[in-house]
Amino acid sequence: MSKGEELFTGVVPILVELDGDVNGHKFSVSGEGEGDATYGKLTLKFICTTGKLPVPWPTLVTTFSYGVQCFSRYPDHMKQHDFFKSAMPEGYVQERTIFFKDDGNYKTRAEVKFEGDTLVNRIELKGIDFKEDGNILGHKLEYNYNSHNVYIMADKQKNGIKVNFKIRHNIEDGSVQLADHYQQNTPIGDGPVLLPDNHYLSTQSALSKDPNEKRDHMVLLEFVTAAGITHGMDELYK
């Protein structure tokens, strides 16, 4: 077990803070909830603290919760491939570019680390080149979320990982908005981290609303499990 993994044996409170600017539309989001890495489970509620969110909530899911991939459930035979937990408590910097097909892109930079007993994800997001009447600024996405695979590989030069994956957002007219994600994670501290073999995270997310919440918000339930590496021979003969 890595030192960082020991911090995730129970339920951990999560705080998310985002400052965003998309085509000049500035906004802030605050999120709170908890994660349980034993089950790969996240429960979070996000509130736009600046009024109405200028982009659809589903376009921010990867920035919020795929930001705290340290809560992914890594099966016993894959624990030596869990970079995310191994970087804790000092944490990691997570940078992404998210390309929306036939539209603009988001660039994000986040620091994910423990502050006391709370896992904090502080994010800056900049979006450019979006069409004012497109699927994103035109709010044409359905309020739901599909399952995805998130592909992870080691980046030995930077002592971190590279990640890529594609999200499919459902559009109200029945079509799909594609969003191609390119991600890099590097540790904040200088302690040892686990550099993984190639594998992926399998994610399932459910979006809902709080009937008692008047502000623009999103409630998120997510399950994430690592896969893609088979048992070694030593595992088979135990």
Epitope: K101, N149, Y151, M153, N164, K166, L178, Y182
Partner: nanobody, 130 residues
Framework: QVQLVESGGGLVQAGGSLRLSCAGS????????MGWFRQGLGEERELVAC????????FYTDPVKGRFTISRDNDKNTVYLQMNNLKPEDTAVYYC???????????????????????WGQGTQVTVSS
């Protein structure tokens, strides 16, 4: 919406060759990593080979390495699969698939997963007799 149409399948004797083609229309062909998959009777659909947007990078699965060659012509919106030294175990329906991607690289594990692909052809049957 990208449409993909495969052709070139057929019946061939073991040791023979076939060249499959997949013609794309309705989108920017060069914006897609292209893959060839196959599905034998009662088997799961599996990746055979894939090629990056420009054609600079390719990937082959072990059973076809050294026998199959994937290539593309973006001016003709077409991807090819040259299959040599065919074996009876190559018998399957062969499908062409397109994965919209921003970078001109192959990510092996992403390309192996069917779920990465956005558009699929209807398939062409390849039968190799012994």
């Amino acid at each position: 919406q990208v449409q993909l149409v495969e052709s070139g399948g057929g019946l061939v004797q073991a040791g023979g060759s076939l060249r499959l083609s997949c013609a794309g229309s309705g989108g920017t062909f060069s914006a897609y990593t292209m893959g060839w998959f196959r599905q034998g009777l009662g088997e799961e659909r599996e990746l055979v080979a894939c090629i990056s947007r420009s054609g600079a990078s390719t990937f082959y699965t072990d059973p076809v390495k050294g026998r199959f060659t994937i290539s593309r012509d973006n001016d003709k919106n077409t991807v090819y699969l040259q299959m040599n030294n065919l074996k009876p175990e190559d018998t399957a329906v062969y499908y062409c698939a397109a994965d919209w991607t921003v970078i001109d690289e192959i990510t092996e594990q992403r390309s192996k997963h069917q779920t990465s692909y956005d558009y699929w052809g209807q398939g062409t049957q390849v039968t190799v007799s012994s």
